[in-house]
Amino acid sequence: AGTPEVWVQVQMEATELSSFTVHCGFLGPGSISLVTVSWGGPDGAGGTKLAVLHPELGTRQWAPARQARWETQSSISLALEDSGASSPFANTTFCCKFASFPEGSWESCGSLPPSSDPGLSAPPTPVPILRADLAGILGLSGVLLFGCGYLLHLLRRQKHRPTPRLQPSHTNSQALTAQAWAPSQASQAALHDPYATINTSFCPATLDTAHPNGWASLPTHAAHQPQGPAASASTPILARGSFVSVENGLYTQAGERPPHTGPGLTLFPDCRGPRALEGRFGVR
């Protein structure tokens, strides 16, 4: 099975220039238990929730969200009403976090292309997940200067080096409006839509014993680094931008009991510990 991928696409409606739609999708074998859409940054890291969608319980949305809905079993859309004359959505980052079992929680962000023609956005394209133990980021200026041939050359050369671990960088809160090459089982070296997505974080799902009241028993040991899905030992990401959020490990706290996601299954949709309880609130 390939590494899960999340894509995000923001487009302006051709008919109403004050209306925007965020489209998000999850490419992975697991079942989705929750989707959280936020703006201004990732959920819980400066972002503000716009909508939460549960595949069965429903959806919940807050202004300026107008309508959140499932487009398929693994993709959602969120229509936004921009009441301001200056169109603040144009420069805003939108993030989608998919909690799934057994992959865990995966979050990607995107923003409206700087010079997008209304209604002419490219179709959503899968964007590779940034895995902390698999991905490396090369120099920012290099991406701008070198062509595809050199990118391929770098990719080939990278395979013979140890991959550097990603560290969160906070020099720029904007999205990675990245032209990225990142082969994986799910998308073999495809050139992705430069505005489709950015920052992606991962946290693992855990299978545990569900109690009759719908909450699971949580391990009390310290956070660990679980093994993720098998993937190539080297998946370099070549990107323009500097905001990368990487969250690996499961952080638990006494009293936190995520809601169940099915008979005998418990998903920890968020590994931030105190925020692990986003679970059940839905959007209508």
């Epitope: 503000t48 936190e256 609130f281």
Partner: antibody, heavy 114, light 113 residues
Framework: EVQLVQSGAEVKKPGSSVKVSCKAS????????IEWVRQAPGQGLEWMGE????????NYNEKFKGRVTFTADESTSTAYMELSSLRSEDTAVYYC???????WGQGTLVTVSS | DIVMTQSPDSLAVSLGERATINCKSS????????????LAWYQQKPGQPPKLLIY???TRESGVPDRFSGSGSGTDFTLTISSLQAEDVAVYYC?????????FGQGTKLEIK
């Protein structure tokens, strides 16, 4: 286990206001939405609206807009529902709830009588 | 707003017998995108808050006995109690979880015959 504990019963005069509290425990207060639902004696359930404590984002049932205000205090993990311009037909049990109505407070009886 | 209408208003069933409650919505609660129905069922006993029984039209909430089942799609839904127990005496509500505002049915009072 998420628990929602509401304030005690209230008796109010018509035209006055009432503020009901709902204290949450066992979860991360700012991460889940608090709903308010009321039930008049012998009647059904009526959704009044909701607040997301983390951002104080709200949704109101049109029927109550202008008369109801939702607030939340993250420092005490408490949500509040204030209903103004009370009339006799507002006599009801007021519930707070969360997680798509999976968890409920015990209810607060508000009696409006002159 | 979506109007939820339950039938019957009250129902008397013998212990061990099957109880069936119907719920009709004024608009479809089926999301065509993921083919899920956004309808929930609640049980409310006297002096208590409601309790979530079923969501997604047919998914039982954790801890709910398997004698409770939900079915239906679109605008017509059914809650079935396969073998009525004394503790099932309560008022049952269906709820639109599809769109704002969430609306509830008027309730069905279930009693023992």
């Amino acid at each position: 286990e998420v628990q929602l504990v509401q304030s005690g019963a209230e008796v109010k005069k018509p035209g006055s206001s009432v503020k009901v509290s709902c204290k949450a425990s066992g979860g991360t207060f700012s991460s889940f939405s608090i709903e308010w639902v009321r039930q008049a004696p012998g009647q059904g359930l009526e959704w009044m609206g909701e607040i997301l404590p983390g951002s104080n984002s709200t949704n109101y049932n049109e029927k109550f807009k202008g008369r109801v205000t939702f607030t939340a205090d993250e420092s005490t993990s408490t949500a509040y529902m204030e209903l103004s311009s009370l009339r006799s037909e507002d006599t009801a049990v007021y519930y707070c709830s969360s997680y798509w109505f999976a968890y409920w407070g015990q209810g607060t009886l508000v009696t409006v009588s002159s | 707003d979506i109007v939820m209408t339950q039938s019957p208003d009250s129902l008397a069933v013998s212990l061990g017998e099957r109880a069936t409650i119907n719920c009709k919505s004024s608009q479809s609660l089926l999301n065509s995108g993921n083919q899920k129905n956004y309808l929930a069922w609640y049980q409310q006993k006297p002096g208590q808050p409601p309790k979530l029984l079923i969501y997604g039209a047919s998914t039982r909430e954790s801890g709910v006995p398997d004698r409770f089942s939900g079915s239906g799609s679109g605008t017509d839904f059914t809650l079935t109690i396969s073998s009525l127990q004394a503790e099932d005496v309560a008022v049952y509500y269906c709820q639109n979880a599809h769109s704002y505002p969430p609306t509830f049915g008027q309730g069905t009072k279930l009693e023992i015959k």
